[in-house]
């Protein structure tokens, strides 16, 4: 399977919401023993690999954010720890999973990951993830209203498998 | 610190069902799984499955899938294990134990301990 | 299902000595991620037990230095280099890479 970032750039003003998304798709095992684990974190643009470094999202890490059910399954986290943060990732049943941030501060720029894990009989056995930048703007140059600028086509399959 | 605790040892007779409860704290209860072992008398141990407290999602091993039920409250951070039509086999130490797994989501080892529950059959 | 033996099943040691347990299993235990999910619990008399060693040679936190795992494929050792009193109980070695996971019968270890 694969993880596709559709926009590889928002740039938002302060104040805003924003919801940043990934998509999974291709085949996808549906037997009763596989599930899969979605989560976001922050991370810096390494050297060798994006997404390397995992860093919280406004205090709250990847387990903390993270989704786990089978197949396609909708699934969002509903615990009060994330949305007293502002937060709240979700999923639906087309592969589409996104994290959603309130309220957004100059402190909320940087680089966003989505990971996917497919597990099996409690064990990894395929990851991926993407990758994207936030932007949030102040004063006069700042947009009026988010802005996402999709990604090109090599960029917006940013796949690493296991 | 990490604490595993169950309930109380229980008398049940054969045919009847009993549910054992683990209740975690020391940790954040949705970052680890949850499994159970049990050891009969004088017995070694023998695991039985494990649920992912975050979705509910349980696995059993074969030899309990129609007898085993594994369930959380996330509001109390506590998990349960039933286990219907007891027979006199099924006397035994049930056991709850932490899983851990790394950063994807990999188990890797059961590390802290409930101090278990005595379940007798008995007619 | 995987059967793991182990050997001995009773294993007497004097304080200081070393001593070494082995555990053999019916097939190998490479999970298909490449990872080897060999652990090693001891029980002590009266207790519930405790994780001393994950993935065949990783030694949990708080677990002395005496204690160490090695092995590959079907053939995994615990050792430990200077044995004392505390160390008394049932050794554990345990797969979890396929499903059912499964426990040796055990090795009970006893001061002489």
């Known amino acids: 399977f694969k993880v596709a970032t559709l926009y590889s750039l928002y740039v938002c003003p302060e104040g805003q919401n924003v919801t940043l998304t990934c998509r999974f798709f291709g085949p996808v095992d549906k037997g009763h023993d596989v599930t899969f684990y979605k989560t976001w974190y922050r991370s810096s643009r390494g050297e060798v690999q994006t997404c390397s470094e995992r860093r919280p999202i406004r205090n709250l890490t990847f387990q903390d954010l993270h989704l786990h059910h089978g197949g396609h399954q909708a699934a969002n986290t509903s615990h009060d720890l994330a949305q007293r943060h502002g937060l709240e990732s979700a999923s639906d049943h087309h592969g589409n999973f996104s994290i959603t941030m309130r309220n957004l501060t100059l402190l909320d720029s940087g680089l966003y990951c989505c990971l996917v894990v497919e597990i099996r009989h409690h064990h990894s056995e395929h990851r991926v993830h993407g990758a994207m930048e936030l932007q949030v703007q102040t004063g006069k140059d700042a947009p009026s209203s988010c802005v996402a600028y999709p990604s090109s086509s090599q960029e917006s399959e940013n796949i690493t498998a296991a | 610190q990490v604490q595993l605790v169950q309930s109380g040892a229980e008398v049940k007779k054969p045919g009847a069902s009993v549910k054992v409860s683990c209740k975690a704290s020391g940790y954040t209860f949705t970052h680890y799984t949850i499994h159970w072992v049990r050891q009969a008398p004088g017995q070694g141990l023998e695991w039985m499955g494990y649920?992912?407290?975050?979705?509910?999602?349980?696995e059993y091993n074969q030899k309990f899938k129609d007898r085993v039920t594994m369930t959380r409250d996330t509001s109390t951070s506590t998990v349960y294990m039933e286990l219907s039509s007891l027979r006199s086999e099924d006397t035994a130490v049930y056991y709850c134990?932490?899983?851990?797994?790394?950063?994807?989501?990999?188990?890797?080892?059961?590390?802290?301990w409930g101090q278990g529950t005595l379940v007798t059959v008995s007619s | 299902d995987i059967v793991m033996t182990q050997s001995p099943l009773s294993l007497p040691v004097t304080p200081g000595e070393p001593a070494s347990i082995s555990c053999r299993s019916s097939q190998t235990i490479v999970h298909s991620n490449g990872n080897t999910y060999l652990e090693w619990y001891l029980q002590k008399p009266g207790q519930s037990p405790q994780l001393l060693i994950y993935k065949v040679s990783n030694r949990f936190s708080g677990v002395p230095d005496r204690f160490s795992g090695s092995g590959s494929g079907t053939d995994f050792t615990l050792k430990i280099s200077r044995v004392e009193a505390e160390d008394v109980g049932v050794y554990y070695c345990?797969?979890?890479?396929?499903?059912?996971?499964?426990f040796g019968q055990g090795t009970k270890l006893e001061i002489k």
């Open positions: 345990f797969q979890a890479s396929h499903v059912p996971w499964t």
């Open positions: 649920i992912i407290p975050s979705s509910g999602y349980s």
């Open positions: 134990a932490r899983g851990a797994y790394d950063d994807y989501y990999d188990y890797y080892a059961m590390d802290y």
